[in-house]
């Protein structure tokens, strides 16, 4: 309605003696700002006078006089749109209708509000969720319609009159929609917790009580039981009896069903508070609880171990592990189901008695090929002794014992021959299923365990064989002792160490890498011919006539071996010069001559030296000398130097005629 | 310190000679040790010898088999330089033209001038 | 006439490395080979003669090698001043000839 004054604020406002009022609140005038605002307390129009009768609280005027009540009474509001009042401290006769009167220029508007309060401080209120279960986390709200700056408050939470160690979390609101003070607690109730008194105590900022508010809680929980047995350690013989007893201590909801479990699984037709075992076998050892339900779920009381006890079964023996490889650890562990646990043990190999060995398990660190065999136990406890079962079999592995190489072969070997070994052995578990030799070759294995070597060779110096199992075990390698002819026959130049230069002292090795037998004899040859029959050939001054091809040969009682032909190289530097000429040695001016070295050197010359009739050097290198034209004033002698890293030869002097052309002839 | 100094046109006519002369300083033409070479050069050939003059006793020449019929170098001993004449230039013979002297005992090329461009074009 | 080839015919390379040309010669020229550095609008120079004898003012990490047909001009650290084109040369037969040149330049 565009006549109306628009007023936001709590409809009712709440309080007690003593205390204080905030009132909270907004406005909108029709037009222009506020002139004049009166605070009245229960106000009444009266007709005749057209005004509002009743208690000036507070009065804001133009002239700007204040009643004395203003002092309790404040506006905290402006001209246009906050409109917030205090009252402080606050009286019981305070209750009513607040009426706020305001003008402006042209326009009026009377609002009211209703304030409450009450003689003494009125009490919270706990709200409760509509359901609580046991260990699920709920939030317990305590709300007072209370809130006032001047007037400090607290809200506490306390079980059966003890302070809640849970944090609480407090919350004011003081708007123009609501005033409150509000403590949530958030909780994880327990069975325990069911009937107990919960209470929010009201406090002033000294902690003095004001007022509270109390619940009972209705925790809904599973049945809680307690269980009791007879005998009360639970430990009984086969054939005794047992009762066991369950009670329930709390559930809410009431309990519905009752049922008993042995090891988790439910006894069937035993539904009652009570389970009876009468004359129990061991089967009946385990654990026991009774199971109690209600609208929440199931509850469950502790466990009972019942133990039945008896002597030990017939056992069996567990070997860890078999078959067993000799040199091995091995662990035998004998079981027999008894209650109590045996004591005592007694163990056998072979159905000897072992000597004492009366553990549960025992422990070879290295087995042997004697230790086969079968192993079986006795068992005892208090109530007697059990009965050897069928025992285990213990089966050692080992590689073959005790392999040799035998030769079949009349001896000596010979380099060709044909040479036939066997593999034996002592033992062996597994049995052996092959062999294996060394060293390698292309050899046949006419059956299991032989060897045939065709054309032997002369470094077949030793074979081995090896018996296999699921291992190898090697013989010690035998000598064939092979016999040969010379190997590797060679000619070696012992002296000079480096290169052989003309006139050096000579010597020749002639060398090979083996024989067998050992005894030797040599030859020497050179072109077909025979030189010697020593190790060694010796030239006390060799000469370059003396190069050529040579070779040894080395013979025992098996063959005569030779050598590869060796070459013998004698450097000598540069002999035997002369210079020839071409076209020859006269020649027309103006046409070409080439002058040509001739030598005999070994290695060949590297570089030619030229010189004139002067002994003058020419700068040419190569072993023709070109003079192209060559001129009547190159006439005279010539000659030449040959070098190699022997050393230096020289020619003796040519001629070179040079004589005029019919051309220059004819010019004179 | 030997230094050699060239001299001659930059620009021949093809058929024309082209001719150059290198003045020696700090050494004699008539050296019983060195030789005296011409050497040109040029993008397509290269590094290229083309002859040698020297004094061992008489005089005597060198000269490379592509320029043979159409080379000849002469020493002068007064002026103590020597020259070289290449007949019948094509532009061919276009190159920078180098004098050398050749040194005993490794006879290689220890001095050489700055070296003369010569275009031979029409 | 006696083919000069060199190898590689150009080569990229740092301040601080080592570089190795090489000149292998058509026939046998003994040790009567000469190296020589060349750089742009300059006539070349001579670095070694006799395949390894290093010419008075060369510096020393300049080196040459061989004899017979195969050749090697070692540069052990090259310097700032060193990218240049380098020429080997025979000097047994006539007429004398050069390799076609190795140009080494700044990586």
């Known amino acids: 309605d565009s006549s109306k004054w628009v007023f936001e604020h709590p409809e009712t406002l709440y309080a007690w003696e003593g205390a204080c009022v905030w009132i909270p609140c907004t406005y909108r005038a029709l037009d222009g700002d506020l002139e004049s605002f009166i605070l009245f307390h229960n106000p009444e129009y009266n007709k005749n006078t057209s005004k509002f009768d009743g208690t000036r609280l507070y009065e804001s005027t133009k002239d700007g006089k204040v009643p004395s009540e203003q002092k309790r009474v404040q506006f905290l509001g402006d001209k246009n749109k906050n409109c917030t009042l205090s009252i402080h401290p606050v009286h019981l006769n305070d209750s009513g209708q607040l009426g706020l009167r305001m003008e402006s220029k042209t326009e009026k508007w009377m609002e009211r509000i209703h304030l409450n309060v009450s003689e003494r401080p009125f009490p919270p209120h706990i709200q409760l969720p509509p359901e609580i279960q046991e260990s699920q986390e709920v939030t317990l709200t305590c709300l007072l319609n209370f809130s006032c700056y001047g007037y400090p408050i607290q809200l506490q939470w306390l079980l059966e009159g003890v302070p809640m160690r849970q944090a609480a979390v407090t919350s004011t609101s003081l708007t123009i929609k609501s005033v409150f003070t509000r403590s949530e607690l958030k909780f994880s109730p327990q069975w325990s917790h069911h009937g107990k008194i919960v209470t929010c105590q009201l406090q002033d900022a000294d902690g003095k009580f004001l007022s509270n508010d109390t619940v009972q809680l209705n925790v809904k929980h599973t049945p809680k039981l307690e269980i009791k047995v007879t005998p009360s350690d639970a430990i009984v013989r086969e054939g005794d009896s047992v009762t066991m007893t369950c009670e329930v201590s709390s559930s809410n909801p009431e309990y519905t069903t009752v049922s008993w479990l042995k090891d988790g699984t439910s006894l069937k037709k035993q539904n009652t508070f009570t389970l009876n075992l009468r004359e129990v076998t061991k089967d009946q050892s385990g654990k026991y609880c009774c199971q109690v339900s209600n609208d929440v779920g199931p509850g469950r009381s502790e466990e009972v171990f019942l133990q039945v006890q008896y002597a030990p079964e017939p056992s069996t023996v567990q070997i860890l592990h078999s078959p067993a490889v000799e040199g091995s650890q091995v662990e035998f562990l004998c079981m027999s189901l008894a209650n109590p646990l045996p004591t005592n043990y007694t163990w056998y190999h072979n159905g000897k008695e072992m000597q004492g060995r009366t553990e549960e398990k025992v422990h070879i660190p290295k087995i042997l090929p004697w230790h086969a065999g079968t192993y079986s136990c006795v068992a005892e406890n208090i109530l007697g002794t059990g009965q050897r079962g069928p025992g285990a079999e213990l089966d050692v592995q080992y590689p073959p014992k005790k392999v040799t190489t035998v030769i079949q072969n009349p001896m000596p070997i010979r380099e060709g021959d044909t040479v036939t070994l066997s593999c034996n052995y002592n033992s062996s578990n597994p049995s052996v299923t092959r062999y294996e030799w060394k060293p390698h070759g292309a050899w046949e294995e006419p059956s299991l365990g032989v060897l045939k070597i065709q054309n032997v060779g002369w470094d077949n110096t030793t074979i081995a064989c090896a018996a296999c199992n699921s291992w190898c075990s090697w013989a010690s390698p035998v000598a064939l002792n092979v016999q040969y002819a010379p190997r590797d026959v060679r000619v070696r130049k012992i002296k000079p160490l480096s290169e052989i230069h003309s006139g050096n002292s000579v010597s020749l090795q002639c060398d090979f890498s083996s024989s067998h037998p050992k005894e030797v004899q040599f030859f020497w040859e050179k072109n077909g011919r025979l030189l010697g029959k020593e190790s060694q050939l010796n030239f006390d001054s060799i000469s370059p006539e003396d190069a050529g091809s040579y070779s040894c040969w080395v013979n025992n009682s098996i063959g005569q071996t030779a050598s590869k032909a060796w070459t013998l190289e004698v450097l000598y530097a540069p002999r035997r010069l002369r210079v020839s000429m071409s076209p020859g040695d006269q020649v027309m001016e103006g046409k070409s001559a080439t002058l040509t070295c001739e030598s005999d050197a070994n290695p060949p010359v590297s570089h030619y030296t030229w010189f004139d009739w002067n002994n003058q050097s020419l700068p040419y290198h190569s072993q023709k000398l070109r003079l192209e034209p060559v001129k009547v004033q190159h006439s005279g002698a010539y000659w030449c130097q040959g070098t190699n890293s022997v050393g230096k030869g020289r020619s003796p002097l040519s001629t070179l005629t040079v004589y005029y052309s019919p051309e220059t002839i004819g010019r004179r | 310190q030997v230094q050699l100094q060239q001299s001659g046109p930059g620009l021949v006519k093809p058929s024309q000679t082209l001719s150059l002369t290198c003045d020696i300083s700090?050494?004699?033409?008539?050296?019983?040790?060195a030789a005296w070479n011409w050497i040109r050069q040029s993008p397509s050939r290269g590094l290229e010898w083309l002859?040698?003059?020297?004094?061992?006793?008489?005089?005597?020449?060198d000269y490379a088999v592509s320029v043979k019929s159409r080379i000849t170098i002469n020493p002068d001993t007064s002026k103590n330089q020597f020259s070289l004449q290449l007949n019948s230039v094509t532009p061919e013979d276009t190159a920078v033209y180098y004098c050398?002297?050749?040194?005993?005992?490794?006879?290689?090329?220890?001095?050489w001038d700055q070296g003369t461009m010569v275009t031979v074009s029409s | 006439v006696i083919q000069m080839t060199q190898s590689p015919s150009s080569v990229s390379a740092s301040v601080g490395d080592k570089v190795t040309i090489t000149c292998r010669a058509s026939?046998?020229?003994?040790?009567?080979l000469a190296w020589y550095q060349q750089k742009p609008g300059l006539a070349p120079q001579l670095l070694i003669s006799?395949?390894?004898s290093l010419q008075g003012g060369v510096p020393s990490r300049f080196s040459g090698s061989g004899s017979g047909t195969d050749f090697t001009l070692t540069i052990s650290s090259l310097q700032p001043e060193d990218f240049a084109t380098y020429y080997c040369?025979?000097?047994?037969?006539?007429?004398?000839?050069f390799g076609q040149g190795t140009k080494l330049e700044i990586k």
């Open positions: 040369q025979q000097a047994k037969y006539f007429p004398y000839t």
């Open positions: 026939q046998d020229v003994s040790g009567w």
């Open positions: 050398a002297q050749e040194i005993e005992p490794h006879d290689a090329f220890d001095i």
């Open positions: 006799g395949a390894s």
């Open positions: 002859g040698r003059t020297y004094y061992r006793s008489k005089w005597y020449n």
């Open positions: 700090g050494d004699s033409v008539s050296s019983n040790s």
